[in-house]
């Protein structure tokens, strides 16, 4: 049998955020219900866990023998604390899309780690903020927008933008 | 490390120009807000200029609105701000600032650069 | 704009002896969002300002627990506990809830009896 430090190595998580309770929940990615030592964990889950706080989940299960493999879940920020936001100027609006994440909440974990990426179209943008000129105007535009954590998607968002009409004579 | 280093700061006569630059290292500048703040001779501290981090949306108070302008290079890690038609008043130590955003706190300052407005 | 008046001027204290700044603004600084984005600034003698309480009453990572900020609407206090040698220098509030129109107090000097 492998070490369930070895069989694990490379295990990835995806956190869901509960709106009512504040709270996270890490979903580990593995094939077989695993145990989590002192964390329970059912459905290879880890619920309650607090915004910008560090657990540690020492995870086994019975294919594999000690050492297990201990894995440090790094939590998101809350998403509540981000809101997607649309900049753009009403006199520009027939031919600029902008939008930019706000951060309407200070928050303790380490700004470092967040990545912004918007893909509007075939277009990618690692940024906070994006600025789109030389539009079509009347064109409808889709932006999708994910923020990640230590390279973990933890929020997303989509916007459908309408440009104005052109200016007559343009 | 997380460094900001201005520099461009000289003595101009009155009714000059001048440009001021800020070099950040160690970290992803594109995410930051940006302002620069001065702090005349007398000690006080002035908010001079905000950039958000994209560079869409700039801002000023009223004593150096149309005279000075900010701007960012995110290619380059480097925030600028153009001052023209200056005065005496605009006599300060210059200091670049980073803030996540609007609601948070400047967190991180560099060391300055003096800016000498004199006949 | 708002205005930010910071008592006193300069503050002569003993080494371990409590100290407190008084910052007020002249109308509040309450945000709509019900945030109070007021902040403390230190300043020691030939270095830049260093951040140490934002939103009034939280502390910045590494900023001791000695200093704490308290107040609401447009009064605000920072306080030093015990004050320690490395404490000395001027200290700023600042208010950043009039979104852009940001303002700084005039500055309190913390300096030795």
């Known amino acids: 049998k492998p070490t369930c430090d070895e069989k694990y190595a490379n295990i990835t998580v995806d956190y869901l955020y509960n709106k009512e309770t504040k709270l996270f929940t890490a979903k580990l990615n593995v094939n077989e219900n695993v145990q989590c030592g002192n964390n329970t964990c059912t459905n290879n889950e880890v619920h309650n866990l607090t915004e910008c706080k560090n657990a540690s989940v020492s995870i086994s299960h019975n294919s594999c023998t000690a050492p297990d493999k201990t894995l440090i879940l790094d939590v998101p920020p809350g998403v509540e604390k981000f809101q997607l936001h649309d900049c753009t100027q009403v006199e520009k609006a027939d031919t600029t899309i902008c939008l930019k994440w706000k951060n309407i909440e200070t928050f303790t974990c380490d700004t470092q780690n967040i990545t912004y990426r918007f893909q509007c179209g075939n277009m990618i943008f690692d940024n906070k903020e994006i600025k789109l000129e030389n539009l079509e105007p009347e064109h409808e535009y889709k932006c999708d927008s994910e923020i990640l954590y230590n390279n973990h998607k933890f929020t997303n968002a989509s916007k459908i933008i309408k440009t104005d009409f052109g200016s007559p004579g343009e | 490390e997380v460094q900001l280093v201005e520099s461009g700061g000289d003595l101009v006569k009155p009714g000059g120009s001048l440009k001021l630059s800020c070099a950040a290292s160690?970290?992803?500048?594109?995410?930051?807000?940006m302002s620069w703040v001065r702090q005349t001779p007398e000690k006080r501290l002035e908010w001079v200029a905000y950039?958000?981090?994209?560079?869409?949306?700039?801002y000023y108070p009223d004593t150096v609105k149309g005279r000075f302008t900010i701007s960012r290079d995110n290619a380059k890690n480097t925030l600028y701000l153009q001052m023209s038609s200056l005065k005496s008043e605009d006599t300060a130590m210059y200091y670049c600032?980073?803030?996540?955003?609007?609601?948070?706190?400047?967190?991180?300052w560099g060391a300055g650069t003096t800016v000498t407005v004199s006949s | 704009d708002v205005l930010m008046t910071q008592t006193p001027l300069s503050l002569p204290v003993s080494l371990g002896d409590q100290a407190s700044i008084s910052c007020r603004s002249s109308?509040?600084?309450?945000?709509?969002?019900?945030?109070?984005?007021l902040e403390w600034y230190l300043q020691k003698p030939g270095q830049s300002p260093k951040l140490l309480i934002y939103?009034?009453?939280n502390r910045f990572s590494g900023v001791p627990d000695r200093f704490s900020g308290s107040g609401s609407g447009t009064d605000f206090t920072l306080k030093i506990s015990r004050v320690e040698a490395e404490d000395l220098g001027v200290y700023y509030c600042?208010?950043?809830?009039?979104?852009?129109?940001?303002?700084f107090g005039g500055g309190t000097k913390l300096e030795i009896k």
């Open positions: 109308q509040s600084i309450v945000h709509s969002n019900g945030n109070t984005y």
């Open positions: 939103k009034v009453s």
């Open positions: 160690g970290f992803a500048f594109s995410n930051y807000d």
């Open positions: 600032a980073r803030r996540y955003d609007v609601w948070w706190y400047f967190d991180v």
């Open positions: 600042f208010q950043g809830s009039h979104v852009p129109m940001y303002t």
């Open positions: 950039i958000s981090s994209g560079g869409v949306s700039t």
